[in-house]
Interface confidence: low
């Protein structure tokens, strides 16, 4: 069973009395609808709050909705709806906060059938005040930001136009009409696809790729026959619509689409998509749907241009484009992935990478665990995550999985052990060392959220009954204390902490319901005084990253280089702080050939680490090798992997080959195969 | 001080099935794997397969896939190796090994191995008509 | 499954000199390897793990090296309590599998 309140847990002294002094209820003067909380800004404490109730009449459906500010992390709001002239906000665009700490805020309000276009309100200082705008159009999507300059907005309308702002909202121009995506791209670029004829969905696959860099004064065409496009990292990803069937390709671009080559992936055919799973600028993983309604496909790492794909896991659970898959980016700890596999018997895997999808493995089984009464095969036994496909499934999980990039190490998710997924009520498990170790952290399923950068653990039982009582650790999870905030019960909705686990604070939210009326609630809670002091240099000890065991001289070494980090010691009970930052020391490792993969025309062999020229070449390598750019082909075989930084050791030079003189094929005339696309 | 001891010589008629003990003390039952090996007269030494203490998972080599079980008893700290069907070829010492790393490992485990640093004192096992 | 090759088979050196004995993996095991010294009679015990560390209590005049496919147990200065039969043993893949020994032998 899980750790809990035995006698060899470090008990914080007189927690109760401390946090008594720092629970903070508010109660909202509103009937229960719907409710949606934002931070504005970065360690501002300042939260803004929207609660909206649909009234259905006959006729029409009456709307109200209340807004409400807090500027101390949520432990006093101030009922603020006459900023906005009680007007309706419409919660399917949400609240369109600004990037950074600019302090922009957009409302998209509910207007009557009958207006010439939509309203916003605006705030640019933390929503201390709104000014109300009048749009020239009805809009379709919320109001998106350009990252480099928070004053250029853009936005869809129901009529296909795309709108562009140049002073945050106060004037829109319309650049462009039949359009159907589009998207910020580097340096205030528009990328966006149009359609000629009759619809976005008509003209699927007959598209064309729009850029403008300079808000719609000029524009250039980057791209025809588009099915769609997405962005990632440094890469522009299209998939291109083939010339003589219903196919579609991927293309990439790294220079903003001056220039395009094809990837070297399966083509896909019209029930099929393409995901981008995760992107950097070092590299992308990309998600191949399989023909026919499988439900899963396969995963590929890309080389650093995202032009040569290794074939990373296969059976990759991915329902439908747009659907559920669990892939899951461990930011705690570089190069780790999780993600689940439907085996062949249709049961439900999950796998792990903890080298960026080189190798995948599956979760070692927490130390003192026993396989579950699921496992059909007791002897082959490992910890399987839930994540949004299970949550999809309407399993009782209520969360996904949880890791923060300043709590080092730390990964806290829903599971269960067996040889599968299980569809019993799940445990929380939770691993300190980025996902190669985990232990049961509480019996059942949770709400859970790191606060203080891992210096404390905050979780809620998830119940159907009312509840109010929280559970609290110091020692990642290792000990639980429970403190009861209420004396009267809520049924609980959320559990709410500044993004970016660096607060302190901890909002719990939910509804009190009466014979007449119910209402919203929320407790707020300080752990600063649980945490008294600040931490110091003795609070903190070496960890080496990824290490099995320290003796060896590889140890540790993860894409070229490894990485100690100063982390809190378990057993220290003090304050990272809101300023606390990760202390790491990378170390350059030798080159192995691990550290590099096969390129194009080459692989590896199962259980050998050299690249072997493939003795021909077949499918979408070889209309890689017909179609793809010339550069492409001529290559000694080894490309080193993206991001990795690696030095000396081994440096697998040999002969360049040119490929060219194996694009050749019985299926194409001797004119196609002449002609190569650049 | 960390030790692993067997059970007695055994003497087996083809066929016949033969289960051999190995009982582990001085050390967390738990935290370590426990591999079987065996060793013919005047041959080398062959790997027969490891077993997880923590809920028995194990892993076989192939040549005796479908004739060996390995199991174990956490109460009392002990892990046994049962082997069917015996031929005249398996007669063998048998020994068990403490093995801290485990094909069963997650992550890059196989990057580093620490080697089977504790054996048995090995059981004799004669398979004789 | 990988295979383990030793050579020589047998070894003959006399009181004090040096012995070099070789393993060869059929394909890389990393550094996923261990030497294990036999004597007439006992189990075997572990001498070098991770191709190259020493095992507690192993005396300094045994070194092992190698990585990938190429391992090398070194004997700096032969002990009459030396000789005996040696194993690799690899941890790369499953099954783990070791070779077929080289046994050291007073010349």
């Known amino acids: 069973s899980a750790p809990g309140e035995d006698e060899e847990c470090g008990r914080v002294r007189d927690f109760v009395a401390k946090l008594a002094n720092n629970t903070h209820q508010h109660v909202f003067d509103d009937l229960r609808g719907s409710v949606s909380l934002s931070w504005v800004g970065d360690s501002t404490g300042v939260i803004l709050v929207l609660t909206t109730f649909h009234v259905p009449l006959v006729i029409m459906t009456f709307g109200q909705s209340k807004l409400y500010r807090s500027e101390d992390y949520g432990k006093n709001f101030k009922d603020i709806t006459d900023l906005i002239n009680n007007t309706f906000i419409r919660t399917e665009f949400g609240m369109a906060i600004g990037p950074e700490n600019s302090g922009k805020v957009v409302l998209t309000a509910e207007v009557s059938g009958g207006s010439r276009g939509g309203r916003i309100f605006r705030s640019s200082d933390f929503a201390k005040n709104f000014v109300q705008t009048d749009l020239p159009f009805h809009p379709l999507t919320q109001m998106m930001y350009s990252p480099q300059n928070s004053d250029y907005l853009l936005a869809l309308s129901t009529e296909n136009g795309l709108w562009v702002s140049k002073n945050f909202g106060g004037k829109w121009e319309e650049i462009h009409k039949a359009v159907c995506l589009a998207k910020w791209g580097s340096d205030n670029t528009i990328f966006f696809t149009t359609y000629a004829n009759g619809s976005c969905k008509a003209d699927l696959g007959a598209l064309e790729l729009w850029r403008t860099s300079d808000l719609g004064k000029s524009f250039k065409t980057i791209g025809v026959k588009i099915y769609s496009f997405g962005l990632g990292g440094r890469f522009l990803f299209a998939s291109v619509m083939a010339d003589k069937d219903t196919t579609r390709r991927i293309h990439v671009s790294t220079d903003q689409g001056d220039t395009w080559s094809m990837a070297q992936l399966p083509s896909v055919g019209q029930e099929q998509f393409y995901s981008i799973l995760a992107a950097n600028d070092d590299m992308v993983f990309m998600h191949v749907d399989e023909p026919g309604d499988t439900g899963f496909g396969t995963i590929f790492t890309s080389d650093d241009r995202g032009i040569v794909y290794s074939k990373s896991l296969d059976r990759h659970l991915y329902t439908t484009t747009g659907g559920e898959t669990d892939f899951t980016n461990v930011t705690s700890l570089r190069g780790v992935y999780i993600t689940s596999v439907l085996s062949e018997d249709n049961s439900i895997q999950t796998m792990i990478t903890f080298d960026q999808g080189g190798r995948w493995t599956h979760l070692r089984k927490p130390e003192n665990s026993e396989c579950d009464a699921t496992a059909k095969n007791k002897n082959e036994c490992s910890l399987h995550i839930h994540a949004s496909y299970s949550i999809s499934q309407k399993l009782n999980v209520p969360m996904a999985p949880l890791s923060e990039p300043n709590a080092v190490g730390i990964v806290i998710a829903h599971g269960s052990v067996g040889d599968a997924i299980s569809v019993m009520v799940p445990d929380v498990y939770i691993s300190d060392d980025g996902g190669y170790s985990w232990t049961k952290m509480l019996e059942g399923p949770h709400y859970y959220t790191i606060l203080d950068s891992g210096g404390i653990i905050v979780a809620i039982e998830h119940s159907s009954r009312p509840i109010n009582v929280i559970k609290f650790s110091t020692d990642e999870g290792q000990c639980w204390q429970t403190y009861t905030f209420t004396r009267d019960p809520i049924y609980f909705t959320g559990l709410a902490s500044e993004p970016g686990a660096r607060s302190m604070n901890i909002s719990i939210w939910g509804f009190t319901e009466s014979f007449l009326t119910s209402q919203w609630v929320s407790y707020t809670i300080d752990f600063k005084d649980i945490l008294e002091r600040n931490c110091e240099e003795k609070d903190y000890t070496i960890w080496l990253a990824h290490s099995t065991d320290p003796e060896d001289y590889e140890d540790g070494c993860i894409l070229g280089y490894k990485e100690q980090f100063l982390r809190l010691a378990k057993s220290s009970v003090c304050q990272n702080g809101r300023d606390y930052v990760v202390t790491k020391q990378p170390s350059i490792c030798l080159c192995s050939l691990e550290d590099f993969l096969c390129d194009f025309g080459y692989y590896r062999p199962e259980n050998d680490s050299k690249c072997v020229e493939q003795p021909e070449l077949k499918g979408h390598d070889l209309e890689f090798c017909l179609y793809g750019r010339e550069e492409h082909l001529t290559t000694n075989g080894y490309r080193k992997i993206p991001g990795d930084k690696c030095q000396g050791g081994v440096n697998p030079v040999r002969e360049v080959k040119d490929l060219k003189k194996k694009c050749t094929s019985n299926f194409l005339s001797p004119e196609k195969q002449n002609s190569k696309s650049n | 001080q960390v030790q692993l001891v067997q059970s007695g010589a055994e003497v087996k008629k083809p066929g016949a099935s033969v289960k051999v003990s190995c009982k582990a003390s001085?050390?967390?039952?738990?935290?370590?794997?426990m591999s079987w090996v065996r060793q013919a007269p005047g041959q080398g030494l062959e790997w027969m397969g490891i077993?997880?203490?923590?809920?028995?998972?194990?892993s076989y080599a192939q040549k005796f896939q479908g004739r060996v079980t390995m199991t174990r008893d956490t109460s009392t700290s002990t892990v046994y190796m049962e082997l069917s069907s015996l031929r005249s070829e398996d007669t063998a010492v048998y020994y068990c090994?403490?093995?801290?790393?485990?094909?069963?490992?997650?992550?890059?485990?196989?990057?580093?191995?620490?080697?089977?640093?504790?054996w048995g004192q090995g059981t004799t096992v004669t398979v004789s008509s | 499954e990988i295979v383990m090759t030793q050579s020589p088979a047998t070894l003959s050196v006399s009181p004090g000199e040096r012995a070099t004995l070789s393993c060869r993996a059929s394909?890389?095991?990393?550094?996923?390897l261990a030497w294990y010294q036999q004597k007439p009679g006992q189990a075997p015990r572990l001498l070098i793990y991770?191709?190259?560390t020493r095992a507690t209590g192993i005396p300094a005049r045994f070194s092992g090296s190698g990585s990938g496919t190429e391992f090398t147990l070194t004997i700096s200065s032969l002990q009459s309590e030396d000789f005996a039969v040696y194993y690799c043993?690899?941890?790369?893949?499953?099954?783990?599998?070791f070779g077929g020994g080289t046994k050291v032998e007073i010349k």
């Open positions: 090994a403490r093995d801290p790393s485990g094909i069963a490992a997650a992550g890059p485990a196989s990057r580093y191995y620490y080697g089977m640093d504790v």
């Open positions: 991770g191709a190259s």
């Open positions: 077993i997880n203490p923590v809920g028995g998972s194990t």
């Open positions: 043993q690899q941890a790369r893949l499953g099954p783990w599998t």
């Open positions: 001085g050390y967390t039952f738990t935290s370590r794997y």
């Open positions: 394909q890389s095991v990393s550094s996923n």
